[in-house]
Interface confidence: low
């Protein structure tokens, strides 16, 4: 029942062009090129894409034409290597072009930059955007794909097509509305926030595949799909996991045409086999392709089958445990994970993977013992502390969130994480801590049964952002250790970190705490970021500062900003009152 076509095609580029259609083909090639060459101007990419598309058409017309039999990596790599400014713009990335495939593509992948030096995207006035949209809709939408792809080099390409479709729909509707801004801006905000979340989730999938291997990704997929489709047989879940792994391996590897094509095939298969997968898929399967794939990926968990037998019978009490394990270790562990996950939609995926790892370690030890059954008889007792640890942590943090609200909860996390890893750059600490803090509003509203999967799996995504940003410029052995030792234990590893006693406090620099009138015109979010940046710098100067000291300084700071933003001569106020604030803060913190 394999989904993916195995027949050989004389021309891979013609095959994908015909499967995907011209519009999707061009969009996906643009995404691929923008994710590789993140600094190239838009016009250069459009030219490259048009050239590739025309070539693909020649191959559609005649598959045996010269070069049509070349692999997509060869064709696309050759095209990227024609960029005249490669050496000046990308430095050593130009050396990739001296390599042969597959090494050349691997080289391009290694040079993808998670934090490219690109200007922040500034949203123009609504009328300006609507004019641009009406003047040239195609260019406008291509520009959207390009700007997102170059800033998010691991964005899930077929999902980006779905975002672009929604982006187009928003402009089509709202540029005709009486109040264009009221219609459009909330939609763009929603797309921006969803897009950031989607990018971060996909980045974790790619990190899982690239840093920890296919087995780690498959284990994650078994657990997640078993929670989502608890009525499906193990063989069905295994089949979906194999296909899903292929899709994500392709997208993470830059094979975006194959990835999009295979994702469409997988959606088709799932919808054709709904009866043996899940009762929740009906609505999704009635939608057009892009919406269908997105809907399936987000579908709610199906109801658990009634009267599932106890897990202990097959995995602890049975005399055949070691025999079954020895015969096919990964299949047996996969079955354990499947059976445990389908019974526990209330657990996070990472917790389920920790339990499976504990079970595996126990079997490895016990199946070599004199009395294996006696040895592994109490294995389920070992699970109790593993389950209680995230439960307690979530309970405590949700209580703190409810007490403080999101902004102050973020500040508490900023202080906590700056003390744990003060070597990390201030912008990274602010970004990561702000995102960690969003777990409160995202997950604490849920009932107990949904809190852990929401919170801990979200935290895995955010901590992966820290890991990939830190990997680019490593500054902390503690971060490296937590990020690389175990994918599923990253969050417990960071939670367990205490204040870094080896850290030498940063020299005090008054310039860091000098503010100007421009802060008054910032949005509330931007103003928060300015204040949170100052808070991180304070902790770096005085890591031993107490919560009370830091709160006093931050309250003074908020009052200072409010006062000067109301002043007639704002700039003078910021200069004079700022000096007083710095002096008072130094005194309060003993700097």
């Amino acid at each position: 029942r394999g989904v993916f076509r195995r027949d050989a095609h004389k021309s891979e580029v013609a095959h994908r062009f015909k499967d995907l259609g011209e519009e999707n083909f061009k969009a996906l090639v643009l995404i691929a090129f923008a994710q590789y060459l993140q600094q190239c101007p838009f016009e250069d990419h459009v030219k490259l894409v048009n050239e590739v598309t025309e070539f693909a058409k020649t191959c559609v017309a005649d598959e045996s034409a010269e070069n049509c039999d070349k692999s997509l990596h060869t064709l696309f790599g050759d095209k990227l290597c024609t960029v005249a400014t490669l050496r000046e713009t990308y430095g050593e990335m130009a050396d990739c072009c001296a390599k042969q495939e597959p090494e050349r593509n691997e080289c391009f992948l290694q040079h993808k930059d998670d934090n490219p030096n690109l200007p922040r995207l500034v949203r123009p006035e609504v009328d300006v955007m609507c004019t641009a949209f009406h003047d040239n809709e195609e260019t406008f939408l291509k520009k959207y794909l390009y700007e997102i792809a170059r800033r998010h080099p691991y964005f899930y390409a077929p999902e980006l097509l779905f975002f672009a479709k929604r982006y187009k729909a928003a402009f089509t509707e709202c540029c005709q509305a009486a109040d264009k801004a009221a219609c459009l801006l909330p939609k763009l905000d929603e797309l921006r926030d969803e897009g950031k979340a989607s990018s971060a989730k996909q980045r974790l999938k790619c990190a899982s595949l690239q840093k920890f291997g296919e087995r780690a990704f498959k284990a994650w997929a078994v657990a997640r799909l078993s929670q989502r489709f608890p009525k499906a047989e193990f063989a069905e879940v295994s089949k979906l996991v194999t296909d899903l792994t292929k899709v994500h391996t392709e997208c993470c590897h830059g094979d975006l045409l194959e990835c999009a094509d295979d994702r469409a095939d997988l959606a088709k298969y799932i919808c054709e086999n709904q009866d043996s997968i899940s009762s929740k898929l009906k609505e999704c399967c009635e939608k057009p392709l892009l919406e269908k794939s997105h809907c399936i990926a987000e579908v709610e968990n199906d109801e658990m089958p009634a009267d599932l037998p106890s897990l202990a019978a097959d995995f602890v009490e049975s005399k055949d445990v070691c025999k079954n394990y020895a015969e096919a270790k990964d299949v047996f562990l996969g079955m354990f994970l499947y059976e445990y996950a389908r019974r526990h939609p209330d657990y996070s995926v990472v917790l389920l993977l920790r339990l499976a790892k504990t079970y595996e370690t126990t079997l490895e030890k016990c199946c070599a013992a004199a009395d294996p059954h006696e040895c592994y008889a109490k294995v389920f007792d070992e699970f109790k502390p593993l389950v209680e640890e995230p439960q307690n942590l979530i309970k405590q943090n949700c209580e703190l969130f409810e007490q403080l609200g999101e902004y102050k909860f973020q500040n508490a996390l900023l202080v906590r994480y700056t003390k744990k890893v003060p070597q990390v750059s201030t912008p990274t600490l602010v970004e990561v801590s702000r995102n960690l803090g969003k777990v409160g509003s995202k997950c604490c509203k849920h009932p107990e049964a949904k809190r852990m999967p929401c919170a801990e799996d979200y935290l895995s995504v955010v901590l992966n952002q820290l890991c990939v940003l830190h990997e680019k410029t490593p500054v902390s052995d503690r971060v490296t250790k937590c990020c690389t030792e175990s994918l599923v234990n990253r969050r417990p590893c960071f939670s367990a970190l205490e204040v870094d006693e080896t850290y030498v406090p940063k020299e005090f620099n008054a310039e860091t705490f000098t503010f100007h009138a421009d802060i008054c015109t910032l949005s509330e979010k931007e103003r928060q970021i300015k204040k949170q940046t100052a808070l991180v710098e304070l902790v770096k100067h005085k890591p031993k500062a107490t919560k009370e000291q830091l709160k006093a300084v931050m309250d003074d700071f908020a009052a200072f900003v409010e006062k000067c933003c109301k002043a007639d001569d704002k700039e003078t106020c910021f200069a004079e009152e700022g000096k007083k604030l710095v002096a008072a803060s130094q005194a309060a913190l003993g700097l």
Epitope: E51, F55, T58, E66, D78
Partner: nanobody, 115 residues
Framework: QVQLVESGGGLVQPGGSLRLSCAAS????????MAWYRQAPGQQREFVAR???????NYPDSVKGRFTISRDNAKNTVYLQMNSLRAEDTAVYYC?????????WGQGTLVTVSS
């Protein structure tokens, strides 16, 4: 960049002949391959003939024996001699050229085969 201009299209009766020309200008030193494609209304673009710098040619079965591609390197021109024309040869004929891929295209010339 390479510019391509086709000429020679027109109305011809079934069984008749026509010769299309394609003149190339611009960065022509990079051109290694030139070809003809055609597109009938509502159809996908279809490969018709190709000639490499060295002079080797290839054709699909639908035109083999009836059409001949040739080039005059001195004039930077490629020709398509079409004999025994049929109604199904009616289409816009495009000239294409490129160093590796046929990435530069002309605007096309219309050929109508009708009695």
């Amino acid at each position: 960049q390479v510019q391509l201009v086709e000429s020679g299209g027109g109305l011809v009766q079934p069984g008749g002949s026509l010769r299309l020309s394609c003149a190339a200008s611009g960065s022509i030193e990079s051109i290694n391959r030139m070809a003809w494609y055609r597109q009938a209304p509502g159809q996908q673009r279809e490969f018709v003939a190709r000639i490499s710098k060295g002079g080797s040619t290839n054709y699909p079965d639908s035109v083999k024996g009836r059409f001949t591609i040739s080039r005059d390197n001195a004039k930077n021109t490629v020709y398509l001699q079409m004999n025994s024309l049929r109604a199904e040869d009616t289409a816009v004929y495009y000239c294409a050229a490129g160093p590796v891929w046929e990435q530069f295209w002309g605007q096309g010339t219309l050929v109508t085969v009708s009695s």
